[in-house]
């Protein structure tokens, strides 16, 4: 009683003329005429057409013929009601209607699940005119059905501002299971339980799931989709997949690797990016993370001097950006540097140790016993000092920098002089008379300029005054520098 076609249903034949019989509203089936060679027979329907309407939405024409007989109502003839076919197969189905020739413009549209099918669909409408009526066959074909073609299809015809709607043709596409959720790769803690999920749909339903671990089935009995596999724990890496079975066959999910979290590998390629007297900028390439994100890293620094006490300085930093500036180091010193990083499981081993050196430092002490006196005859200021006690890490003395500031009547002028490392005296020209000259001296190495000595002041009188005794920095423990006259 249900009119349906199976997937092997072939296209309807092209009828050589109009359908036999006049317009009908009963359920007498539409019989095909003998088919042309090369065509398969039309689908045949049971004579009673049960499950089909006797009444419905039909257009009742108001026009009458010459004999003034009212025309019968218009309705689509009944066609196949249910088509079951496999994915990727082709299908063709049609709607047919006989329309009195008094109607000129008739268009048939196809609709699926309430939406009009436009564009890239294969819809063909054929007209077979006769004396009084024109048989119209609207065919719809899909060359390779997809799951998305599943649905209820209807024809609509606009005529005389009326809409005539066919009964539906149910298209049921069946195929291999289609995954809607596949297991995903995970990184898990050793011997800790975890879940994997697999979900697949038909039609046909039901879809049953088998789990596979390292090519062996986990469950002997299938589980209904969706399926959650609880793995009690792993001690080594494993590959899981799921098989989805339905009446059409089997689909296998992608295989996913489940990794066991471990401590990271040690960093590699620790390198020196930049060195200063008291800091070293290092970078490193992180090792394998052990399937768990790095949390932070530890930089270990040892003095390379065999005479050192061997203590290790530890600097903690974030795992990114694989760069760290080690500070508070001694100048002109050698260090061994190693890097270790950690994840949630623990610390990696230390990277291979590398040697690094700080550069020379600037002097840490100012020149001592700075003395300043005026040589009025030559209009010069003579400056003398003692070489500072330089430490080894301060590097080699390359000279001195002398700052002399001249202040007179609200005017202040600073000048700098550079002096070679050999001497311990200098002479500067008087810049301004009737002014105070303030002198400071700093030692200079390749590592930079050291601290300046305490200022020594000397008053430079106007021309014709007597010589003055020198000014000097005080002996240690004395008060501020004084001007000695």
């Amino acid at each position: 009683a249900i009119t349906e076609a199976r997937e092997e249903a072939k296209p309807y034949p092209l009828f050589p003329g109009p359908f036999p019989g006049s317009l009908q509203t009963d359920h007498t089936p539409l019989l095909s005429l003998p088919h042309a060679s090369g065509y398969q027979p039309a689908l045949m329907f049971s004579p009673t057409q049960p499950g089909r309407p006797h009444t419905g939405n039909v257009a009742i024409p108001q026009v009458t013929s010459v004999e003034s007989k009212p025309l019968p109502p218009l309705a689509f003839k009944h066609t196949v009601g249910h088509i079951i076919l496999s994915e990727h197969k082709g299908v063709k189905f049609n709607c047919s209607i006989s329309v009195p020739n008094i109607y000129q413009d008739t268009t048939i549209s196809w609709w699926k699940d309430g939406k009009e099918l436009l564009g890239a669909h294969h819809a063909i409408t054929q007209f077979y005119p006769d004396d009084e009526v024109t048989a119209i066959i609207a065919s719809f074909s899909i060359t390779s059905v997809q799951r998305s073609d599943n649905g209820s299809y209807i024809c609509k015809m606009k005529i005389n501002n009326e809409e005539i709607v066919s009964d539906p043709i149910y298209i049921e596409v069946q195929g291999l299971p289609h995954f809607t959720k596949q297991p995903e790769s995970m990184n898990v803690t050793r011997n800790t339980a975890f879940n994997l999920t697999c979900q697949a749909v038909g039609p046909p339903e039901p879809v049953n799931i088998f789990w596979v671990q390292n090519s062996s089935r986990v469950n002997e009995q299938p589980e209904k989709s969706p399926s959650v596999l609880t793995v009690p724990g792993l001690t080594e890496m494993a590959v899981f997949s799921c098989e989805a079975h339905n009446d059409k066959g089997l689909t296998v999910s992608k295989g996913v690797q489940i990794n066991i979290k471990a401590i990271p590998s040690p960093p590699t390629e620790v390198s020196i990016r930049n060195s200063t007297a008291h800091s070293i900028l290092i970078s490193w390439v992180p090792g394998f993370d052990g399937y768990s994100p790095f949390r932070n890293c530890s930089i270990q620094v040892k003095e390379a001097d065999p005479l050192s006490n061997g203590s290790v300085m530890i600097f903690n930093t974030s795992a990114l950006p694989h760069l760290y500036q080690i500070k508070q180091l001694q100048a002109l010193a050698n260090y061994s540097i190693g890097v270790s990083c950690m994840n949630e499981i623990g610390w990696s081993a230390v990277s291979p140790w590398i040697l690094a050196s700080t550069t020379e430092g600037a002097p840490s002490v100012a020149p001592l016993n700075v003395t300043v006196f005026l040589n009025e005859s030559s209009d010069n200021v003579d400056i003398r000092w003692m070489k500072p006690p330089t430490k080894q890490q301060d590097g080699e003395l390359v000279g001195y920098r002398i700052s002399h500031v001249w202040q007179s009547a609200g005017i202040s002028k600073e000048l700098l002089e550079e002096v070679g490392q050999n001497g311990s005296r200098a002479r500067i020209s008087v810049q301004v008379h009737n002014a105070t000259c303030t002198v400071r001296i700093a030692a200079v190495t390749r590592g930079g300029v050291g601290p300046f000595s305490d200022p020594v002041k000397i008053f430079i009188p106007a021309h014709g005054w007597v010589d003055y005794a020198p000014s000097s920095t005080p002996a240690p423990g004395n008060a501020d520098p004084v001007l000695i006259i």
Epitope: A1, I2, E4, A5, R6, A9, L43, M44, F45, S46, T48, P50, G51, R52, P53, H54, T55, G56, N57, G81, H82, I84, W111, K112, D113, G114, K115, N150, G151, S152, I154, I164, V165, S166, D167, P168, Y170, I171, E172, P203
Partner: antibody, heavy 118, light 112 residues
Framework: QDQLQQSGPELVKPGASVKISCKAS????????IHWVKQRPGQGLEWVGW????????KYNERFKGKATLTADTSSSTAYMQLSSLTSEDSAVYYC???????????WGQGTSVTVSS | DAVMTQTPLSLPVSLGDQASISCRSS???????????LHWYLQKPGQSPQLLIY???NRFSGVLDRFSGSGSGTDFTLKISRVEAEDLGVYFC?????????FGSGTKLEIK
């Protein structure tokens, strides 16, 4: 989620009529047949008929011709069944159900109880 | 009309047992194109019927694999491999091959 929501219980007098409703949601109402099924208390199920909301076409079980009238309002996605000239024999729970693509009644309403009593 | 005879009317079972319900039609339910429109439903107390098996042997979406259907022509069987408490209710067969559509009289599955 495809759903059919039926109207509430009805208590009617003999000889009267009643119209019960079935509101569809979650799918294209005009594309699938709606069937109606009767179940008398403690008894089996009896098919009343169907309507195709897309064109209003109907088909009835001979036993319910003249008793049941099936209609549909596409603007509200609601199917109706009117029962007329009610007697105690019409007291039952009436279900609406959708004929799905698999050509089975796949989704059912929760049922509407009709009690005919004076 | 296609008369559907369902047996037994009542089926007492123990939890975990297998249950088997038969449905026989007065005429073949095979359609001219080879499909058989015989479906099985479960109606739990106070609920609407719910589809279990469609077209003889296809489990509907969400139905557990404990339920299986078989048969052809006029004789059909629903099997429940391991009965659980949630399976209790009345089971109906329905044919939609011939109009009017007809239901079986129902089988009440109950605990022994």
């Amino acid at each position: 989620q495809d759903q059919l929501q039926q109207s509430g219980p009805e208590l009617v007098k003999p000889g009267a009529s009643v119209k019960i409703s079935c509101k569809a949601s979650g799918y294209s109402f005009t594309s699938y047949y709606i069937h109606w099924v009767k179940q008398r208390p403690g008894q089996g199920l009896e098919w009343v008929g169907w309507i195709f909301p897309g064109n209003g076409n109907t088909k009835y079980n001979e036993r319910f011709k003249g008793k049941a009238t099936l209609t549909a309002d596409t603007s509200s996605s609601t199917a109706y069944m009117q029962l007329s000239s009610l007697t105690s024999e019409d007291s039952a729970v009436y279900y609406c159900a959708r004929l799905g693509l698999i050509y089975a009644l796949d989704y059912w309403g929760q049922g509407t109880s009709v009690t005919v009593s004076s | 009309d296609a008369v559907m005879t369902q047996t037994p009317l009542s089926l007492p079972v123990s939890l975990g047992d297998q249950a088997s319900i038969s449905c026989r039609s007065s005429q073949s339910l095979e359609n001219s194109n080879g499909n058989t429109y015989l479906h099985w439903y479960l109606q739990k107390p106070g609920q609407s019927p719910q589809l279990l098996i469609y077209r003889v042997s296809n489990r509907f979406s969400g139905v557990l694999d404990r339920f299986s259907g078989s048969g052809s022509g006029t004789d059909f069987t629903l099997k429940i491999s391991r009965v659980e408490a949630e399976d209790l209710g009345v089971y109906f067969c329905l044919q939609v091959t011939h109009v009017p559509f007809t239901f079986g009289s129902g089988t009440k599955l109950e605990i022994k």
